[in-house]
């Protein structure tokens, strides 16, 4: 019982449940691969539990290990569209620090209009994550499908 | 030493750790486009802690953010028969109550027979999930080829 | 306050936390399909924390319930590539004890080049997983292309 | 360190036979694969043909039936024998040496021109 009422009084964010469920805002200009995201509970869904948003783009605040999601849907798409535009990539990763930088998850669409993965990896206080989708095809904005989240999992 | 103890008599429950992984049972009759799900240890790796089953579609137990996950693989497919049937699209989403009618997750099957995704989203005690499948193919019902679930991830 | 010492003072394993995500590290000869994976911190950003490698297969070591995820890319591969090699197939199974045998997890790659997915499966301390890949395509070793991994959810 | 040294490339007909070879020397240990890629003026890099460690091979669509990567019994030398050879073949072909713990080492490149 104590534990009960004690785990009730300490802030969630102590027991380190950082988590975040971003929807697509726009991407950027041409020669700007990353997908810039939004959350909020105005917006619909998604939302920002200890994780920050920075022009776009996903900053983590708390040591650990996540599991990073990721679905992408090309808005106009037909396979015959998405081979004769291949190879369109997304590629989700730590951009920043620098020193940090690394590709994390990657799929191309080949014949396919939607990509989704996970993975668990572990990440930092300050990390950035960018998601770059490289080709000429525009994502969807729809809500149910495109969307990008982290949890955190364990210290 | 104390709150390990404490930890092992609570309850799971009161702990959170709303779970359910479900297999595919039927699917309705010709006007109805959703998946009939089933769940417990009787048939095998499928099972329901918290959530429960209502008509073969998932009822919540307990507010949270969740981590919702679906794979269907179509029955009797090739590359050429999932095109041939274009559009066949399977859409996740709370369809009652009807005043949080939603769709959550959304993905076309194109040339592939199998389509596999996951995201994070908040529901409340009393969420259905339904799980339509429009088209005129049938989904497998082998449990490692089409499956659904659910896990409470915070508050 | 008491109970956020007493969880700094327990050890992480206590608290059930298993998690692993492995890397590829080589397939086996023609008439071997399993993937053979590795971890660890100086391979990069894999790791196991409770889970063990037995000759290259992820054996448990906790009972629980788990988030079982998989992301396989063929290394040299088009559409065109993929179709004329279906079928392709990636099974996640249990694999040993021989009693416990049984197919988790399976995906083909049809057209697509990249298969991903995860499921919830109750797993017992001594199960071995294996990752059958059938099909004469070799995977890719690339880290943000193929990757392997478990989280340990609830008991 | 390990070095890698391409030979074998030149200007060949349309429809001849050319054999690439490629010699590992340094500190050799735990190679996963051997990989033969190839580099086409203005083109990204290509895969071409995979050995791994299990003797299992594989092949970019292009070059199926036409190309075989084999290596000697040390595995310090791979070859690629390139039978049947076309004009967009012509590329600047590189040696790949994959080792277990994830090290890539690479050759300087050997140069294949199919012309008549």
């Known amino acids: 019982q104590r534990f009960a009422q004690a785990q009730q009084q300490l802030p969630l964010e102590s027991l380190g449940w950082d988590v975040a469920e971003l929807q697509l805002n726009h991407t950027g200009p041409q020669q700007d691969p990353r997908l810039y995201w939004q959350g909020g509970p105005a917006l619909g869904r998604s939302f920002l539990h200890g994780p920050e948003l920075d022009k776009g783009q996903l900053r983590i605040h708390r040591d650990g290990i996540y599991m990073v999601h990721i679905q992408v849907t090309l808005a106009i798409c037909s396979s015959t569209t998405a081979s004769r535009h291949h190879p369109t990539t997304l590629a989700v990763g730590i951009c920043s620090p620098a020193s940090r930088s690394i590709s994390l998850l990657r799929l191309s669409f080949h014949q396919g209009c939607t990509i989704a993965s996970q993975r668990l990896t572990p990440l930092a206080r300050g990390d950035t994550l960018c998601t770059n989708l490289t080709g000429t095809l525009l994502p969807s904005r729809n809500t149910d499908e495109t969307f990008f989240g982290v949890q955190w999992v364990r210290p | 030493q104390r709150f390990a103890q404490a930890q092992q008599q609570l309850p799971l429950e009161s702990l959170g750790w709303d779970v359910a992984e479900l297999q595919l049972n039927h699917t309705g009759p010709q006007q109805d486009p959703r998946l009939y799900w089933q769940g417990g240890p009787a048939l095998g790796r499928s099972f329901l802690h918290g959530p429960e089953l209502d008509k073969g579609q998932l009822r919540i137990h307990r507010d949270g953010i969740y981590m919702v996950h679906i794979q269907v693989t179509l029955a009797i497919c090739s590359s050429t028969t999932a095109s041939r049937h274009h559009p066949t699209t399977l859409a996740v989403g709370i369809c009652s109550p009807a005043s949080r009618s939603i769709s959550l997750l959304r993905l076309s099957f194109h040339q592939g027979c199998t389509i596999a995704s996951q995201r994070l989203t908040p529901l409340a005690r009393g969420d259905t999930l339904c799980t339509n499948l429009t088209g005129t193919l049938l989904p497998s019902r082998n449990t490692d080829e089409t499956f659904f679930g659910v896990q409470w991830v915070r508050p | 306050q008491r109970f956020a010492q007493a969880q700094q003072q327990l050890p992480l394993e206590s608290l059930g936390w298993d998690v692993a995500e492995l890397q590829l590290n080589h397939t086996g000869p023609q008439q071997d399909p399993r993937l053979y994976w590795q971890g660890g911190p100086a391979l990069g950003r894999s790791f196991l924390h409770g889970p063990e490698l037995d000759k290259g297969q992820l054996r448990i070591h906790r009972d629980g319930i788990y988030m079982v995820h998989i992301q396989v890319t063929l290394a040299i591969c088009s559409s065109t590539t993929a179709s004329r090699h279906h079928p392709t197939t990636l099974a996640v199974g249990i694999c040993s004890p021989a009693s416990r045998s049984i197919s988790l997890l399976r995906l083909s790659f049809h057209q697509g080049c990249t298969i991903a997915s995860q499921r919830l499966t109750p797993l017992a301390r001594g199960d071995t997983l294996c990752t059958n890949l059938t099909g004469t395509l070799l995977p890719s070793r690339n880290t943000d292309e193929t990757f392997f991994g478990v989280q340990w959810v609830r008991p | 360190q390990v070095q890698l040294q391409e030979s074998g490339g030149g200007l060949v007909q349309p429809g001849g036979s050319l054999r690439l070879s490629c010699v590992a020397s340094?500190?050799?240990?735990?190679?996963?694969?051997m990989n033969w890629y190839r580099q086409a003026p203005g083109k990204q890099r290509e895969l071409v043909a995979i050995l791994n460690r299990a003797g299992r091979t594989d092949y970019a669509d292009s070059v199926k039936g036409r190309f075989t990567i084999s290596s000697d019994n040390a595995k310090t030398t791979v070859y690629l024998q390139m039978n049947s050879l076309k004009p967009e073949d012509t590329a600047l072909y590189y040696c790949n040496l994959q080792t277990i713990s994830y090290h890539d080492f690479w050759g300087q490149g050997t140069q294949v021109t199919v012309s008549s």
């Open positions: 340094g500190s050799i240990f735990s190679i996963a694969r």
